[in-house]
């Protein structure tokens, strides 16, 4: 685990000609933010496409009034760094969207209003715990300076936060098997190992053996999703024994949300569901029309032209929030069975199967050959306790998937000449044979023993069998 | 036919990675998961992790966490695994397999192997 | 993580001979699918292991009816019915229920 930090160090106008206006103005003073996306690895995506490391909002900026007549300076910035935390391992290698967000403090209706002024990206090579690295970006005629760096929140340690310092136990050196801490000489490396059993999905340690819940789960491999239907009886059972949750101040009291937005607890904080119209953390962000690409992940906007008007997001599969901001997890339905991993694919769901089952979703146990587990259009033959393939003309192996040769059966009769072909075999029948196997001799009159000769074929032409 | 053909022989110095490269011919490897393991001189087999090409999904061995990284370019039908911080123990044969077209936990085709040597 | 100990660890047999190789877990394999995911595969020098059963007792595609498959929760068995000269060879078992372990191996050689 660990933080990537961000720390803006100046936002205006680029060098060169056709410098940009300013952005605010006496009539609409207005002020900074900027949201930092992260993503791992080096691959190009789609800005749409999701913070899968995390994202970032800073704070709002002073606000700031344009001098009439003077070009756009380097803008007021908000204090402080971005921070990014970081739960599993830092992956090396990032890309990274950073966004200039104006927010105009003249008196609209509803509140302030939010526009897109600049977009920058980049992919970067960085090691955890190293120094601060410095960059600028140019978005058309704007010019943002940067620095970041990714640091290990203890205890973790290492270019990719994987390896675990503890405080040496004797003074002189490390546990057996166990290697100083670089650079912390004074600490060794731990390997930190939960609980056995403990979920990997909604338990974590701090300490080796341990094995803490995340919020909404208990037991003591936190596998027990909280119950609060037990807390309703005064006579119940403790909370300690049934794992109920014992109402507390929690991140939705007080509904943060803002402009009617419906408030819902998370693992670390809250989510706001806003209306249409509104968006933000706190669906604070009003005004917005589709010039200013509300629709996120590749959302349609519909409407909205301008921003009196409601504009309308149609999502992309996958994809739901009245700003198409929110991934639908069609996997935590579970719906792949019998052990099946589940693969969100966009565009469509995948179950990749456990041996023995096969189907869309694991539902058919191979043993009875319910399920299609066959390539290339082969067929599941019952046998001997489990299945087998019988492969299409053309296919072999244990399932179908490896190319055989046709005529290794030689399958032309009467000495007939065999050529595989990309759709099957061809027989080159010996003088007097004809048919698909060379399997019909034509009599000496000329006439064959089939009814009729396809038109166009003579005796003795390769037959094609499909 | 389905195969899967592995990067030549590499020797490296203890500290370096090492980073093999497995092709695979006959199916597409985002079909199948590809497993990575290894196999000391004269010892036994040892499962370091799997990756599943669809979306870059990765499990890996606790034994070999952290310094382990399989990846894939399913336009090149190669997936590949990097081990770094390399040490003498491992010096091994690494093979790359995969599972079969409809159950992804079964080791059903295997590389040639490719050997690491880890020497100063 | 789950422990394979397989026994023996090397045993001598002739051709024709019935042998039989153990594996046990340090805890049950079988998966909350009702099934067991224990695997027997054989190698030979120089070459990449072989899958010869998967699910405790299914023989793969092409493997000689002579291997065979058995047991249940933590010990299993496989058995060569009559030893042919190109079953000599090391022969591991696989658990795949909790991730992936192996077996340390068993090595078989001609008397």
């Known amino acids: 685990a660990g933080v990537f930090e961000l720390q803006i160090h100046s936002f205006g106008p680029g060098p060169g000609p056709g410098a940009p206006r300013s952005p605010c103005s006496a009539r609409l003073p207005c002020r900074l933010f900027f949201r930092v996306c992260l993503k791992p690895g080096l691959s190009e995506e789609a800005a749409e496409s999701p913070c899968a490391l995390g994202a970032a909002l800073s704070a709002r900026g002073p606000v700031y009034t344009e001098q009439p007549g003077a070009p756009a300076p380097d803008l007021p910035l908000p204090d402080g760094l971005l921070q990014v935390p970081f739960r599993d391992a830092w992956p090396g290698t990032f890309s990274f969207i950073i966004e200039t967000w104006r927010e105009e403090l003249g008196d609209q209706i509803g509140g302030p209003a939010w526009s897109l002024l600049a977009r920058v990206a980049g992919r970067r090579r960085l090691a955890a715990g190293g120094p601060w690295a410095r960059d600028i970006q140019r978005a058309g005629a704007w010019e943002l300076r940067f620095s970041y760096r990714a640091r290990c929140e203890p205890p973790a340690v290492g270019t990719a936060c994987t390896r675990l310092c503890r405080p040496r136990s004797a003074p002189s050196r490390c546990g057996p098997g166990l290697r100083p801490c670089a650079p912390l000489e004074d600490e060794c490396e731990a390997p930190l190992v939960c609980r056995a059993g403990c979920s990997p999905e909604h338990g974590f340690c701090e300490q080796p053996g341990e094995c803490r819940c995340l919020e909404g789960w208990t037991g003591p491999l936190c596998t027990v999703p909280v119950s609060t239907s037990s807390c309703l009886s005064p006579r119940g059972p403790s909370s300690a024994t049934t794992g109920c949750l014992v109402p507390g101040p929690g991140p939705c009291d007080g509904n943060p949300c803002a402009n009617g937005g419906s408030c819902s607890e998370t693992p670390r904080s809250f989510e706001c569901t806003c209306p249409r119209g509104f968006y933000g953390l706190r669906c604070e962000v009003s005004g917005v029309t589709c010039a200013d690409g509300p629709c996120f992940n590749g959302g349609l906007c519909v409407g909205g032209a301008d921003p009196d008007s409601a504009y309308i997001c149609h999502c992309p599969p996958g994809f739901q929030g009245s700003n198409c901001e929110k991934r639908v997890d069609r996997c935590s339905l579970q719906p792949c069975r019998n052990g099946g991993l589940c693969l969100d694919l966009g565009h469509a769901l995948r179950c990749r199967c456990r041996a023995g089952f096969a189907g869309p979703r694991c539902e058919h146990d191979l043993d009875d050959c319910a399920g299609r587990a066959c390539a290339n259009g082969g067929t599941c033959v019952e046998g001997g306790g489990a299945h087998r393939c019988s492969c299409a003309l053309g296919f072999g192996g244990r399932d179908c998937r490896e190319r055989a040769d046709p005529c290794a059966a030689r399958p032309c009769a009467h000495g007939g000449r065999c050529y595989a072909h990309f759709s099957g075999l061809v027989c080159a029948c010996a003088p007097g044979y004809m048919g698909a196997r060379c399997e019909f001799p034509v009599h000496p009159d000329g006439a064959s023993a089939l009814p009729a000769a396809p038109p166009g074929l003579r005796p003795g032409d390769p037959q094609r069998y499909l | 036919q389905v195969q899967l053909v592995q990067s030549g022989a590499e020797v490296k110095k203890p500290g370096a990675s090492v980073k093999v490269s497995c092709k695979a011919s006959?199916?597409?490897?985002?079909?199948?998961?590809i497993h990575w393991v290894r196999q000391a001189p004269g010892q036994g087999l040892e499962w370091m992790g799997w990756i599943d090409s669809e979306n870059g999904d990765t499990e890996y061995a606790s034994k070999f966490q952290g310094r382990v990284t399989i990846t894939a370019d399913t336009s090149a039908n190669t997936a590949y695994m990097e081990l770094s911080s390399l040490r003498s123990e491992d010096t091994a044969v690494y093979y790359c397999?995969?599972?079969?077209?409809?159950?992804?936990?079964?080791?059903?085709?295997w590389g040639q192997g490719t050997l690491v040597t880890v020497s100063s | 993580d789950v422990q394979m100990t397989q026994s023996p660890s090397s045993l001598s047999a002739s051709v024709g001979d019935r042998v039989t190789i153990t594996c046990k877990s340090s805890?049950?394999?079988?998966?909350?699918?009702?099934?067991?995911?224990l695997n027997w595969l054989q190698q030979k020098p120089g070459q990449a292991p072989k899958l010869l059963l998967y699910?405790?007792?299914k023989l793969e595609s092409g493997v000689p009816s002579r291997f065979s498959g058995s047991g249940s929760g933590t010990d299993y068995t496989l058995t060569i019915s009559s030893l042919q000269p190109e079953d000599f060879a090391t022969y591991y078992c696989l658990q795949t229920t909790h991730l992936y372990t192996f077996g340390q191996g068993t090595k078989l050689e001609i008397k």
């Open positions: 805890q049950s394999l079988l998966h909350s699918n009702g099934k067991t995911y």
């Open positions: 006959g199916f597409n490897i985002k079909d199948d998961y």
């Open positions: 699910l405790v007792s």
């Open positions: 397999a995969t599972s079969s077209y409809w159950s992804y936990d079964l080791l059903v085709y």
